[in-house]
């Protein structure tokens, strides 16, 4: 018996087609993805093959203005239209709190939403009861297939699930649910979830009875043969893991942003054992036409986005200096504003010993693309912020050793004075540079804001300590020459859309007045260029 699994993960609000790098589509003939194009391909496969499931491994929420405006209603609407068969909860589904998940998505989805390792307690337990399930048995042709869901147990550090959801260890939580499915005589079981490729592989290895793992969170691209676009495969598709009980378990993921549709064919014997598995992600490029009816619906929903982007979010009473003359040479107040917003967006009081789990932010000055003039009645709009942050990136959470941070700050000024983008803006960090010293030895003071303290204060950076830092995904991926971050990071979790983070902060503060306040200093008077 053959099953076709179509799967997406980490779509992050890419409802419309995008450019090849998943940013805004400029030249339509070269654009990719989007729900209208995805629907065309899904329908084509559904018509051609008998036993097809369309699954999503989480993080539909967060990533473009679509989510900012529609807050998840767009996810329910278009996933319903595409007739998804099941979805696992990702960490970003909790970005607007539990209510922001329940009302727009859980109550409106016409498909089951799954997670076995999230347990509700207190008053939330009865409220959320039945709105997501640990597993779902799906009818496929004359057979049944069990789908068990899982979600990153780091979600309380990455999003806003509140205090009444407990995120258990994935493997511990999955095993009893799989065992239960086995007692119900369900002999074909897919683990569908959002904990990253390393955990996907562990689940394949450790959870007895799981036949296939369909994952997300780490944006992992797997491919067998010559890859069709820019993504470099992390391994073959499917990635085969030998389980502790000797079975070959296929593990798949489909990169991110709806650029690919994962396509996996599994052959089962009559006892539900996997005999063979093969496939590849399908690149959703312009050779696949956009479905006209879904496209028309997208265009209808788009109208509200255009209106939103010109509305006032808040006001500034000072000039927001995002000029390259400032932000690539010295502390600029636009950099301070953005870093303050990044930290504010990551406030999570999950431990009494810590005022927050993260206090530091770094931001490449080259990523700040425009100032905002306060002489327009102080008004700040989404449109203004899109000029400051035009690349459609995210502000991510990483863990780095102090020694890596030191290297990053040396890189920040290794060729100072040439107006290059690697000059770092900061938050929760005080740095002093001496430009009279040779490149690689210019950081003379680097103090960082404590987290395990009731009164935050600045302490010298410790080389062997592990620190959490919020930074643009561009830097986490080694952009602007920050190869040391990419090579040495100990953990990387994708965060919220950059513009959304800043816009939320401005809306919250109502009136802003960021200052230049001595976060970045130069000794020996080398701060004039």
């Amino acid at each position: 018996w053959e099953l076709t699994i179509l799967h997406t993960n980490d779509v992050h609000s890419r409802l419309e087609q995008t450019s090849e790098d998943s940013s805004k589509c400029v030249n339509a003939s070269r654009c990719m993805g989007g729900v209208a194009r995805l629907f065309t391909k899904v329908q084509q496969i559904r018509r051609a093959e008998p036993n097809v499931l369309l699954l999503d491994a989480g993080d539909q929420y967060q990533g473009t203005i679509w989510f900012t405006v529609y807050k998840g209603a767009e996810v329910a609407h278009f996933m319903n239209a595409l007739r998804y068969d099941a979805m696992a909860l990702g960490n970003h589904e909790f970005d607007n709190g539990v209510e922001g998940l329940i009302e727009p998505l859980l109550k409106e989805a016409k498909f089951p939403i799954l997670s076995a390792n999230i347990k509700a307690k207190g008053p939330l337990a009865s409220q959320i009861s039945g709105l997501y399930l640990p597993y779902k048995v799906l009818p496929v042709g004359d057979e049944v297939v069990g789908i068990v869901g899982y979600t990153s147990k780091e979600t309380p550090f990455l999003s806003n699930p509140g205090t009444n959801l407990v995120f258990e260890d994935e493997i511990t939580a999955l095993q009893p649910e799989v065992d239960k499915l086995k007692t119900l005589n369900v002999n074909k079981i897919i683990a569908l979830g959002h904990s990253g490729f390393e955990m996907d592989k562990l689940i394949a290895q450790k959870v007895r009875g799981v036949d296939v793992v369909v994952g997300g969170h780490s944006n992992t691209f797997l491919y067998t043969g010559n890859p069709p676009s820019k993504e470099v495969p992390a391994g073959k598709y499917p990635f085969i893991v030998t389980s502790d009980d000797g079975r070959k378990v296929p593990v798949v993921q489909a990169y991110a942003f709806g650029k690919y549709l994962g396509y996996l064919k599994i052959e089962f014997d009559e006892r539900g054992n996997v005999i063979s598995s093969h496939g590849n992600p399908i690149l959703l490029n312009s050779s696949i036409p956009e479905d006209p009816s879904i496209k028309a619906d997208i265009n209808k929903w788009r109208i509200k986005l255009d209106n939103y982007s010109t509305q006032e979010l808040g006001k500034t009473i000072v000039y927001l200096d995002g000029s390259s003359q400032s932000c690539r040479f010295r502390e600029c107040n636009m950099g301070n504003l953005i870093c303050d917003a990044m930290i504010n967006n990551n406030l999570r009081h999950t431990d009494e010993m810590f005022w927050n789990h993260v206090s530091m932010c770094i931001l490449n000055g080259g990523g700040i693309r425009s100032p905002i003039d306060e002489r327009n009645n102080g008004t700040i709009t989404w449109e203004n912020l899109a000029a400051v942050l035009p690349f459609g990136g995210t502000f991510d959470l990483v863990q780095l050793k102090g020694s890596t941070l030191k290297k990053a700050f040396e890189h920040s000024v290794h060729r100072y004075g040439q107006s290059t983008g690697e000059f770092l803006q900061v938050g929760g960090i005080h740095v002093v540079y001496d430009l009279s010293r040779k490149p690689g030895d210019r950081v003379v003071k680097l103090d960082v804001l404590c987290t395990k303290c009731r009164v935050p204060s600045y302490d010298p950076l410790k080389m062997d300590e592990v620190y959490k830092v919020i930074l643009p995904n561009f830097l986490a991926n080694g952009g602007d020459g920050f190869q040391m971050i990419k090579d040495e990071l100990l953990r990387h979790d994708s965060g919220d859309q950059d513009i959304n983070v800043v816009s939320t902060y401005i809306s919250k503060m109502k009136v802003i007045y960021p200052a230049v306040e001595g976060r970045i200093k130069f000794s020996h008077h080398h701060h004039h260029h």
Epitope: K107, A109, K110, P112, K136, V137, P139
Partner: nanobody, 126 residues
Framework: QVQLVESGGGLVQAGGSLRLSCAAS????????MGWFRQAPGKERVFVAA????????TYGDSVKGRFTISVDNAKNTLYLQMNSLKPEDTAVYYC???????????????????WGQGTQVTVSS
Amino acid sequence: QVQLVESGGGLVQAGGSLRLSCAASGRTFSRSTMGWFRQAPGKERVFVAAIRWIGGTTTYGDSVKGRFTISVDNAKNTLYLQMNSLKPEDTAVYYCAATAGGPYYLGGRDILYDYWGQGTQVTVSS
């Protein structure tokens, strides 16, 4: 909270009629299959009838065909089971069930249903 609440059960003479209702709340059911199952004392739970919430396609268990009619009122979010020509062997606790949506399904495999009511007792006396 997803809830299915049955009502309408009771004691009835053989040959009589009853109409069971099941009020569904807490989420959309528009791509769900809704079903009625029953369980007689000391017996397994068995399938009675099912209906697609949208479209209204139906299917019935062999023992009730021609006597029972399943229906939904979308506006009231309510499932019904009209039971005519009742027999003593129809005596059971009747459960309303629903799927969480997903693939098209119309049938009686109870493991494919995700939500269950508490049940309502139907007793048919001879």
